[in-house]
């Protein structure tokens, strides 16, 4: 046959040679010819490639800079990045994790949805009625109203999304 | 198109030693392909002797080892063969190859 | 070393013959990736080799297709499929997989 046009599953064609490609973990030092293999060498220590590959240079792993509040959650390996999570109370900006922000709180009449992650930012949610928040937080859920009956008590002051019901005792002259 | 030209040869004395060269042109000897030496006795077949790598390492013939030496000057883009203690039996063309291309060859005659 | 014998040793023939050399390897010539080094070249009274087949069975730039190689492990050929005048030369197998690279004894193709 006259050399070939396409290639298999890792390799690749270069000079009408169907060459193979470097592992992940290695990169390419120099391309097969008629009568040599594909020569691949070992990435560095901080390198990496993650797929089978003819890069003639590795990737730097992700570096986890603590003054942007990063911090290493997965060290890398010649066939992975390192990946970065933030320091407690912190969260990332993107799906890359370039940078942290302080986690948001919820404000007085919202409370805590979801608490955050090293990767998403709080989620909060209006007190719904009979329910409230007096508090800016990271963490409070939105607290019940408290149940004047059950202490056989009774609503003296209306309950609002920032302030519990205020109790007290009923009145001795009704019948 | 990649061209090699050989020099050096000739008329050797026993236990002398000989310098071939190859200049090659049409394509870095340091950009890939290995580099080899092959010779040819007079009326006989093919031997390989060894190659010079484009990243300047080598390989022998075991049989050849302890007497021959591939080297390089990348500047003149040219490979060398250095062979030592000659006998009657290393007569020959010497050739040199990236083996799709090859020399015009040189004749090596060791005789007193 | 992976010993190469190619057979026949010489062999007469007519133009339009269809013409097969072989060559076998005393060691598996597949390497891990695969992949086989196996070539063949051409080689006519005083003139250096010509590559004509390269990696079992891939025809070099510029060989006509009358010229074909197969096999695998250790054992090929070269198929000429109708001989021409000017194929009457001898032919070389060639292993590049292991060091020391080897070469057959050589197939002389004579005109009958």
């Known amino acids: 046959p006259e050399p070939p046009t396409a290639c298999r599953e890792k390799q690749y064609l270069i000079n009408s040679q169907c060459c193979s490609l470097c592992q992940p973990g290695q990169k390419l030092v120099s391309d097969c010819t008629e009568f040599t293999e594909t020569e691949c060498l070992p990435c560095g220590e901080s390198e990496f490639l993650d797929t089978w590959n003819r890069e003639t240079h590795c990737h730097q792993h992700k570096y986890c800079d603590p003054n942007l509040g990063l911090r290493v959650q997965q060290k890398g390996t010649s066939e992975t990045d390192t990946i970065c999570t933030c320091e407690e109370g912190w969260h990332c900006t993107s799906e890359a994790c370039e940078s942290c922000v302080l986690h948001r709180s919820c404000s007085p009449g919202f409370g805590v949805k979801q608490i955050a992650t090293g990767v998403s930012d709080t989620i909060c949610e209006p007190c719904p009625v009979g329910f409230f928040s007096n508090v800016s937080s990271a963490f409070e859920k939105c607290h019940p109203w408290t149940s004047c009956e059950t202490k056989d008590l009774v609503v003296q002051q209306a309950g609002t999304n920032k302030t519990d019901v205020v109790c007290g005792p009923q009145d001795r002259l009704r019948a | 198109e990649v061209q090699l030209v050989e020099s050096g040869g000739g008329l050797v004395q026993p236990g002398g030693s000989l310098r071939l060269s190859c200049a090659a042109s049409g394509y870095s000897i340091t950009s890939n392909y290995y580099w080899n030496w092959v010779r040819q006795a007079p009326g006989k077949g093919l031997e390989w002797m060894g190659y010079?790598?484009?990243?300047?390492?080598?390989n022998y013939n075991p049989s050849l080892k302890n007497r021959i030496t591939i080297s390089r000057d990348t500047s003149k883009n040219t490979f060398y063969l250095q062979m030592n203690s000659l006998r009657a039996e290393d007569t020959a063309v010497y050739y040199c190859a990236r083996l799709d291309y090859w020399g015009q060859g040189t004749l090596v005659t060791v005789s007193s | 070393d992976a010993q190469m014998t190619q057979s026949p040793s010489s062999l007469s023939a007519s133009v339009g013959d269809r013409v097969t050399i072989t060559c076998r390897s005393s060691q598996s010539l597949e390497n891990t990736n695969g992949n086989t080094f196996l070539n063949w070249f051409q080689q006519k009274p005083g003139k250096a080799p010509k590559l004509l087949i390269y990696?079992?069975?891939n025809r070099f730039s510029g060989v006509p297709s009358r010229f074909s190689g197969s096999g695998s492990g250790t054992d090929f050929t070269l198929t000429i499929s109708s001989l021409q005048p000017e194929d009457f030369a001898t032919y070389y197998c060639l292993q590049v997989t292991h060091v020391p690279f080897t070469f057959g004894q050589g197939t002389k193709l004579e005109i009958k």
């Open positions: 010079i790598r484009y990243d300047g390492s080598n």
């Open positions: 990696r079992v069975s």
